[in-house]
Every structure is written in C-alpha cells, then in structure tokens.
C-alpha cells in the first residue's frame, strides 16, 4: 500500500504519527502552550493521501494559531470591561454590578492558555427568585429570566463555540437549579489536569460517600450519598482501542485505569469493576457478574492482559456498542438479583469512558445511555444511582457535543472533560480520588498529590509543646487522642501548660489544643536499669494524650490507622476474621521494611525497619555506645523486643524533637502506624541552625547511627486497655 507524503510540518509546532506513514496512521499536531494547531490532525488514507477530518476544501498548510477566550455576549444588571470580540491569553475581563445588585462569582477573570477563563461566572443578583440567578457564562446566550420554582432557563452558545453542561435547567423546590452550569468553549479548548482532578474527584467522592463503616454515627457527605456496608458500587471502565489511539496511548489508558482501580479499592466500600475495551466492537475483559470483579488483583490482572491487538480487525469507534455492553451486563445482573430486590436497587453505577474521538459507527451512544437510565430507573429521586464520566483525550477529534451529551449533569459537578494528552489523563487519575477531603474519621489518608503541603501529606502529625518550645511529636489516632512517647513528659504530672498543635486548613501555624488527660505508661522509667550500668532505658516509652476537644477532620487533620483495629482492617481490605497477628504479618513482612517518619520541618523521611535476623545485627551496634551503657553485657537488656530498629545504610535518623512521632508505612494508598520514634545513637539536628538543616553522620562514626522505635504490635495490651472504647480492636 502506498505511504503518505512526509511534507506535513507545522510551522512553530510538532507532530506525532500513530502508525508511521502507512495508511490508517493518524498524524496529530501540537503547539506550544497558548497556541493551537489548525488543523489538529490528518489521517493517512488508503490512497496514500492525507485527509483532514471534517475539512471540506483541499489540504491547507498546518499552522499554530493563538488561543483566544470567548467574549461575554450579554451580562445582566451590570457592565464588563474591556469589550472585545474575543480575548487573548493573559487578558482580563472585569465585572461590576448596578446599584441594588450584589456580585457573585469572580469580579475579574483571566484568559488561560487552554482557551478557558479562570474563576467563576460573574452574576449580578438581587436575591429575588426562589433560585439564585443562574447567570450567563461567557460566550452564552440565555432565554428565560424568571427564577421561581418550576421555571426553566435555556442556553445556547454564540458563533462556533461548543456548549458543555446543561442546555436547559429548571429551578427545583430546594432552591437549586437542575443539571450543571453550561460553559461555552472554543472547539480547540481543553481542560488542565489540575482542574479536572478535583472536579472529577469531588464528584466521585460524592458518589462514593466513602463512609467509614465502623463509625458509630454516620455523617453524610457532599450529595449525601451513602454507600453503607450493605451498599455496592459497580464501576464500568470503558477504554477506547480504536485505530486513532496509538499503542503507547492505550498503555497509558490501561495504567490510568489501574490507578483508578487501585484507588477505588482503597475506599471502604463494596465494589465490582467491569473492564471493557472497544473499537468497532466491544470486548468484555471483566464483568461485574464475575466474582473476580470484586478482587482488586484479579481486576488489575485482567487490565494488564488487555491487548491493543485485540481490536486490529475492526478499528472504528463504536461507543454505542461499548455502552450497550454495559446495559446488557446491567440487564443480566437485574435478572439474576430480581428487579424488585433491594440487592439490585441499592447498587450504584459509575461508568468511566476514556476515548480519543467521536463515535463513527454503530449509531448514537446517547441511545445506549437512555437504555441504561431506563433500566436503572433514573429519575429525580434516583439520580444519585448513576454517574457517567466522559473523558476525551487528545483535543484532536474529540467531539465536545457528544461527550457532553453522554456525561451526567449534576449540580455543582462536571462529568465531561477533554484533556490534552494521555499524560494529562494519568495525572488526573493519580490525583482525582483524594479521600483526604472527607469529613469523617476515615483513618490513614494522606494527600499524595505533588502540590499537597507537608501537613496534608501526613495529616495525623502533631507537635507537642510543654511551654513555648516544641519538644516532641505525636500522631492523631482518633479525633481526640494522640499517641506519643512517654519520655516527652518528665516534669511530673502537671500538663496544664502543655499544648498539642494539630494541622488546620485555615492556618499554616495549625491549631492549639489543651490536654484533658495524659496517660503515661506506668512501666516507663528511664532510670530503671541505672544500677546495671544502663544510664538511660526506654522500655514502655509510650503515652496517650486526650485532647480537651475533638479535632474537626479536614485535609490537614485526620487520624492514622492503628494496626490490629477494625479501621485498619478495612483500609487493608482484609477479610473480617483477621487477627492482630495477620496485620503484623502483612505490614512487617520482610527482613527490611521501608517506612517513614516526619521531620521537624514537616517533610516525610525514609527509614528501613529491620526484622528477623537483620533486627539482631541492627541492634548489636548498641554495645559500642560506651557513654550511655558503660558496662553492657547483653544488648537485649537495652534493646528489648519492644523496639523496632532502623538507621542502617541510607536511612535518615530522627532528631530528639521528632520523638513520639509516628513510624508508618503505606499500603494501598493508606498509612499505618507500626511504631513511634523513641531513642537513638545519633542526633542529626544537634546544634543545627534551624529545622531545615540535618547533618549526616560521618561514615567513620563509632557507634554508627541506630534508631529505636516502640513497636505497637508489642504494646497491644496497654493500647487496648486505654483505647478499647475509642477504637475497635481485632483479636490478638
């Protein structure tokens, strides 16, 4: 077959080819930020000629054009400046209201490099209607100006702009407009990952409810959807595998879906995942009817086995057939469970469609969506039982209208997105399910996104201050209890002056709490073995502090999971009959277990906890410490089995002021405290200028650094004695 000519350069930009110069290959142009390619793509036809999708005239030279943002068509009850036909990237538009009207939304908006305005739609409202004035987004025209219960407003976009969101909205009894705000956008515009992740995440978190099933009192969240323990979520992942998706892009689709699966299983809900790849025909790799769909490893392995070549004989984009296979799956499940049963009616369904283009065969995908809505009986009351997310990737041939038609429309949420490329998709899926926004006491959740603050990454981390100076660290293990080290409290029992500083989203300095009660292990006595020549002994170095008030859960304050509790068992996704021993075997399962602690400056530092034979050689070094232990005969007199040991090779050593802080590990995107920092042979902070400077021990140091942490698996009786009514402990 003839190949297509290679004279396809774009001035000021670059291009990629999905299958070289051969027929069927898709050429995709890209331009630097702030510019867009025209045309966006070309397809190599079997005749050996390039064709521009949607073009009517012959091949024109590809160029990078400046991105512009749409102008307001009308702005009610106020004025905007400057008045331009469209706005350049970086350009501002300002809004002011007439007397008697209050501005809601952003008074100044800036045109971003993706052709989208920052901020929120500006509205001049006098608060007269049953519903607030829904406003008119930039580039849109609205008909309908009554905002009473039952009134409707309709939107369309001017010139060649594309509408996403709801073209019609109704003022509902609760004073909220139905659907989602319409936005008019340039056909070439796309979404930035940092905008999509939270929007998608918020919607998804609403849907999941992510309720901690062990909570004594259930609190609702967001759209107040609760997937209780009896509730169930069916997640359907639809991956486009058509010709225009390169093999590399398909791999990223798969990887992104894996991330999604991994995250979804870290929520404490019952979930089944279906995997469907599609081109001209769909291929079901995992059905929700299969028991394995509830098993994360099985789902991920079926994803890994998804093969790009499965669809090489049919390379069109049949989105209808893909959605129809979801419908058929639902139909089978309904027949199996019984249409009238709670088991069927209580299942929530989420469909995530990852595509790079418009459907070009098999009929309108909207028909399949209508069938799905019908079988699930989606009406105003049951609107929360279905969410369809339509995610277009790679601006080129993605049809905004179609994506918008497929995506769900819910107040304050977005379900349709277009991302620039698969790399952006990967970024979104990495950050979208940020459970840390939840308000309940779900444990062990830290925000892992790149732009999170230290406190958001380790929201359980607290600072303990006896007076003005900080002395120790600790970890929230519930909304009112902090776990720390006993040796921090050496001033007798007067803790009235002590404060615990807990993370707070409203203040970078955190929030101070008084201590209602300090429970210091009675077994702790630093001088207990002085007559044996052990000048300091740290056995039983553990304490609990009950704060005077409950901490409000937030992105900056949330408990860590304590092993051997039901809360941790759920986070580990372990079966119900699990024991404390099972948790120890799962978490401390290697000779060298990677773990972390939090530094004085809030950053997360790495250590390796030595187990088994390696624990013995790790602890042995203590015999070289002649000042603290002048005539030590048996290392185990000092390093009892209550301690975990770290500090070898590349490990960081904790400073004295980091004592009491959590030693924790990450499993399944959740964090578990296995120890607490107690004592060590080297202090990297000693005499440093500030919290940011640590000195590594010289290689020749005798003894070499070693650090010892109270092992929480060895403190179970004491923890259970004092926290029995706070946490739900598993059998030992």
């Amino acid at each position: 077959a003839p190949s297509c000519p290679q004279n396809v350069n774009i001035s000021g930009g670059t291009f990629t080819l999905s299958h070289g110069w051969a027929p069927g290959s898709l050429l995709t142009y890209s331009c630097p930020q702030g510019l867009y390619p025209s045309p966006a793509s070309r397809l190599c036809k079997s005749s050996g000629q390039w064709q521009t999708p949607g073009a009517t005239r012959s091949l024109s030279k590809a160029v990078c054009k400046p991105v512009r943002c749409p102008a307001p068509v009308s702005f009610e009850n106020g004025i905007y400046t400057p008045r331009l036909g469209s706005y350049p990237v970086g350009g501002n538009v300002s809004f002011e209201c007439e007397d008697g009207f209050i501005l809601r939304g952003s008074p100044v908006r800036q045109c971003r490099p993706n052709g989208m305005w920052d901020g929120e739609t500006a509205v001049c409202d006098n608060g007269a209607g049953h519903c607030p004035n829904p406003g008119i987004s930039l580039g849109a025209v609205r008909t309908g100006f009554r905002f009473g219960h039952g009134d409707k407003v309709r939107y369309r976009c001017s010139s060649n702009l594309v509408l996403t969101g709801s073209s019609e909205r109704e003022c509902q009894g609760n004073g909220v407009w139905s659907g989602t705000e319409p936005i008019c956008r340039q056909p070439y515009s796309y979404d930035f990952p940092e905008d999509v992740a939270p929007a998608l995440g918020t919607s998804f978190s609403h849907m999941l409810g992510a309720t901690n099933p062990t909570q004594k009192t259930k609190e609702s969240l967001g759209r107040k959807i609760q997937i209780q323990r009896s509730g169930h979520l069916n997640l359907y992942l639809l991956l486009d595998c058509s010709q225009s998706v390169s093999e590399n892009d398909f791999l990223i689709f798969k990887e992104s879906a894996s991330l999604m699966v991994d995250r979804i299983f870290s929520f404490e809900i019952n979930v089944s995942v279906a995997i469907i790849t599609f081109a001209s025909e769909p291929k079901v790799l995992m059905s929700v009817l299969n028991d394995n769909s509830r098993d994360m490893t099985e789902v991920i392995s079926s994803l890994e086995n998804a093969n790009y070549k499965d669809h090489e004989n049919g390379t069109g984009t049949n989105t209808y057939a893909a959605l129809n296979s979801v419908y058929l799956m639902m139909n089978n499940q309904m027949r199996l469970l019984g249409m009238e049963t709670m088991a069927w009616q209580e299942i929530r369904h989420a469909i995530i469609l990852l595509t790079d283009g418009k459907s070009n065969m098999g009929g309108s995908p909207k028909t399949a969506v209508d069938h799905i809505r019908e079988i699930l009986n989606i009406n105003q009351k049951r609107n929360d039982y279905l969410d369809i997310y339509a995610i277009g990737v790679g601006k080129l041939d993605v049809d905004w209208r179609e994506l918008n038609e497929l995506g769900s429309k819910k107040d304050g949420e977005r379900h349709a997105f277009i991302l620039q490329d698969t790399k952006a998709l990967h970024q979104v899926f990495e950050h979208m399910l940020d459970v840390s926004k939840l308000t309940d006491t779900i444990c062990g959740v830290g925000n892992m996104s790149a732009n999170a603050s230290d406190q958001e990454r380790t929201p359980w981390h607290v600072t303990i201050k006896p007076k003005s100076q900080e002395t120790c660290r600790g970890a929230l293990i519930s909304d009112q209890w902090v776990l720390t080290a006993a040796h921090c409290f050496r001033d007798g029992n007067d803790h009235s002056l002590w404060r615990v500083n807990v993370g707070d989203p409203k203040s970078q300095w955190g929030k101070e709490f008084l201590i209602e009660k300090a429970v210091i292990s009675p077994g702790f006595d630093v001088f207990a073995k002085k007559n044996q020549g052990i000048l300091e002994f740290y056995g039983d170095d553990i304490a609990l502090l009950k704060l005077a008030q409950k901490v409000k859960m937030s992105t900056h304050a949330r408990p860590i999971c304590l092993p051997c509790t039901m809360e941790a068992n759920l986070a580990l996704r372990r079966p119900q009959g699990s024991t404390c021993r099972d948790h120890e075997n799962e978490l401390l399962n290697k000779q060298s277990v990677p773990a972390h602690f939090v530094a004085l400056n809030g950053s997360k530092l790495n250590i390796n906890l030595k187990m088994g034979v390696e624990w013995t050689s790790c602890a042995e070094v203590v015999s070289q410490e002649k000042t603290m232990f002048p005539n030590l005969t048996d290392v185990r007199e000092v390093v009892t089995d209550q301690f975990l040991c770290s500090g070898t090779q590349e490990d960081e050593s904790p400073c004295k002021g980091e004592s009491g802080g959590a030693v924790f590990l990450e499993r399944r995107f959740r964090f578990f405290q296995v120890g607490l920092v107690s004592w060590g042979l080297y202090n990297p902070c000693l005499g440093s200028a500030d919290k940011n400077s640590r000195k590594r021990a010289p290689r020749s140091k005798v003894p070499p650094p070693r650090d010892f942490h109270i092992n929480l698996f060895r403190m179970q009786p004491w923890l259970r004695q004092h926290l029995g009514d706070v946490l739900n402990f598993l059998p030992l």
Epitope: T471, R490, L535, E536, T627, C685, G687
Partner: nanobody, 122 residues
Framework: QVQLVESGGGLVQPGGSLRLSCSAS????????MGWFRQAPGKEREFVAS????????EYADSVKGRFTISRDNSKNTLYLQMNSLKAEDTAVYYC???????????????WGQGTLVTVSS
C-alpha cells in the same frame, strides 16, 4: 523558662585547663537537656557539647572531642564544662543553653546565658 548564668572564663595559656560553670534557676533544670555553645569574634555561634536531662548521654563537636568534658549536678542546678589541652582556636565567648527537646536548634533556643569569655593565648 530557665535563667542561666555562666562563670569560670578567663585567660589561659595554650595547653592549659579551665572549668566553666553554668548556674540555673528554676526547679525544672533537671528536666532540660543542657549544652555549651561558643562564638569566636566574627564567626557564627557553634555547638560545643550537650548532656541529656538524665546525665546519661553526652555529645561533643568533633573539634573538642577528647579534650572537653560536659557534666551536670542536678542537686545543685549546675552545668559544667571541663576544658583541657586548650588551643588558641578555642578562644571565644562560651554560652550555656537549656533545651527541652535536646536538638539545640539555634533558631529555637530561648534559654541562653549572657556568656563568659575564654581567651587562650601565650
């Protein structure tokens, strides 16, 4: 907060010895890590030695290891620094410091003495 007063500084010949004392007021002396810092003319303040609140563990800067010894007497609320084999480069104002955590971060220390001058010169 602990109030600290140093004494014992003076002029001494190279190779000589000197014992500095630091007297602390306040009944919480026994629960503080204590340390010595020094500042030579035109230089930054630097860590010299520290001792734990129990007296069981001590730390020294490499430059003084083997020549200086830090000790404390909790019954007298006093900290000591025995300095032997003094060198010209030990000339500095010596400060005593108290720190509850034991890290002695210069940015965070709020209990300092006023200092005592040690001059090592022939």
């Amino acid at each position: 907060q602990v109030q600290l007063v140093e004494s014992g500084g003076g002029l001494v010949q190279p190779g000589g010895s000197l014992r500095l004392s630091c007297s602390a007021s306040g009944h919480t002396f026994r629960s503080y890590y204590m340390g010595w810092f020094r500042q030579a003319p035109g230089k930054e303040r630097e860590f010299v030695a520290s001792i734990s609140w129990t007296g069981g563990s001590t730390e020294y800067a490499d430059s003084v290891k083997g020549r200086f010894t830090i000790s404390r007497d909790n019954s007298k609320n006093t900290l000591y620094l025995q300095m032997n084999s003094l060198k010209a480069e030990d000339t500095a104002v010596y400060y005593c410091a108290a720190d509850y955590s034991g890290d002695f971060l210069l940015s965070d220390l709020d209990s300092w003495g006023q200092g005592t001058l040690v001059t090592v010169s022939s």
